[in-house]
């Protein structure tokens, strides 16, 4: 960066090189160039010469003043006009940063995704700080009183093998940057209560042409958890509001859920599960699309689904007798 240049003098910032966004700041430049009494001193920000709010303080020093500085980062340098020198002479440079102290981290959440071998902790960091902000996650065993600390810039994955202090822990997060430090409330967890079952996936759908046509959604999960509660939500792609069905599920076999839907309508389905009675849900599964036939039976397979929503990509549906193409970009 600009800070690595060889200096013939120095440049400094008041109140500091990293300061609160919106502050008034002064940048000073002091020349110490051999055989040069600078006629003029100049400031540059990101390579552009500044023309206002500059004043010479004395023989060797000048000041640049900014009111309400709002740029997160800027590279500053200053130069001198030396008598009998054709070009300006570089004095020094400095990278400056503005931002905010961290907010108090809140909504601290720790979960263990089944089979991951990790406890994943996340939190709401609050407003953007614009400057380098580090987070220290504290994990303290309520049984052994032993505390471990993990440094990160966002979320953290902690190996469950390292959680040797029993099942009950306190977790809290400290946020710190050059402008301040804040600490979250403590979250009490029990390792058995924060497991999220292995992802539930919708594999296919078929509409059976009975007296009243019904659609069967096939879905499954690799979870080994015995008591699992799930929700499936569905809607016509043109609708805004979801319909939700609840299930108590045993994943020893593929699940089949029946729906009585309107004919010749494109529907979207999603599923999520949690260990029964626990706090945390899986995220909703990928969108699964199925268009009900006018009257003819139809099967839609997972193989013809895409995971992107509103991407404008094409979804293929298997119908009896021919292959149809539907645009995916029309869900409400």
């Amino acid at each position: 960066g600009i800070t690595n240049i060889n200096c013939s003098g120095h440049i400094w910032v008041e109140p500091a090189t990293i300061f609160k966004m919106g502050m008034n700041i002064s940048i000073y430049c002091q020349a110490a160039i051999k055989n040069c009494q600078p006629r003029k001193l100049h400031f540059y920000k990101n390579g552009i010469k500044e023309r206002f709010q500059i004043t010479r303080i004395n023989k060797t020093t000048a000041r640049l003043w900014y009111k309400n500085f709002l740029e997160p980062h800027a590279s500053m340098y200053c130069t001198a006009e030396c008598p009998k020198h054709f070009q300006e002479t570089l004095i020094c440079g400095k990278d400056i940063s503005s931002g905010y102290p961290p907010d108090i981290p809140d909504e601290v959440t720790c979960v263990i995704y089944e089979y991951s071998g990790n406890m994943t902790c996340t939190w709401n960091a609050g407003k953007l700080t614009y400057i380098d902000t580090k987070y220290v996650v504290h994990v303290k065993s309520l049984e052994t009183e032993e505390e471990q600390q993990y440094l990160t810039s966002s979320y953290i994955n902690i190996s469950t093998d390292s959680l040797q202090g029993g099942k009950k822990y306190l977790v809290w997060v400290q946020a710190a940057n050059a402008l301040g430090m804040e600490e979250s409330k403590q979250l009490q967890i029990h390792l058995d209560d924060i497991v999220i079952p292995s992802a539930a996936v919708i594999s296919r759908a078929e509409t059976i042409n009975a007296t009243v046509p019904k659609t069967i959604i096939y879905w499954d999960s690799q979870t080994t958890i015995e008591k699992v509660s799930c929700e499936m939500r569905y809607k016509a792609t043109t609708n805004q509001t979801w319909n939700v069905k609840e299930f108590d599920t045993n994943f020893t076999y593929v699940q089949q859920s029946e729906f009585y839907l309107e004919p010749n309508i494109k529907y979207v389905f999603q599923v999520r599960c949690q260990e029964t009675g626990k706090r945390y849900w899986q995220p909703w599964s990928s969108l699964f699309f199925h268009k009900t036939p006018e009257t003819v039976p139809q099967v839609t397979s997972k193989a013809f689904q895409h995971d992107t929503w509103n991407s404008g990509l094409t979804v293929a549906s298997i119908s009896t007798g021919h292959l149809t193409s539907d645009n995916r970009g029309d869900i409400g």
Partner: nanobody
Framework: EVQLVESGGALVQPGESLRLSCVVS????????IGWFRQAPGKGREGVSC????????AYADSVKGRFTISRDKAKNTVYLQMNALRPEDTAVYSC?????????????????????WGRGTQVTVSS
């Protein structure tokens, strides 16, 4: 931005004295060097003298050394040019100029290109 207003110009006889004033207003904290320039009829603008606000260092053109003296009154935001032993060749419109970044060292002869703010000038005529 600073505003500069000159006064004190007059018709005088050779050998007489005159004091010109330059009042600086506006954002007076932003200027550093104040210079005096003159422009005789049919000629280019010529640097006469300058002074630094920070330390009072002064500089003069060779043609006026020993006859003219520049000074400042910080409290009044005014710069003066005391002109003694005036000659007919001193006849010109005298203007003051300011610059926030310029440092007038003792060996410096004021250059028009070094100054960014200008007054409108005051007429000095030396004639018998």
């Amino acid at each position: 931005e600073v505003q500069l207003v000159e006064s004190g110009g007059a018709l005088v006889q050779p050998g007489e004295s005159l004091r010109l004033s330059c009042v600086v207003s506006g954002d007076t904290s932003t200027y550093h060097a104040i210079g005096w320039f003159r422009q005789a009829p049919g000629k280019g603008r010529e640097g006469v003298s300058c002074i630094n606000r920070s330390d009072g260092t002064t500089a003069y053109a060779d043609s006026v050394k020993g006859r003219f003296t520049i000074s400042r009154d910080k409290a009044k935001n005014t710069v003066y040019l005391q002109m003694n032993a005036l000659r007919p060749e001193d006849t010109a419109v005298y203007s003051c100029a300011a610059d926030p970044m310029l440092y007038c060292d003792t060996d410096y002869e004021p250059q028009t290109t070094d100054f960014t703010s200008w007054g409108r000038g005051t007429q000095v005529t030396v004639s018998s």
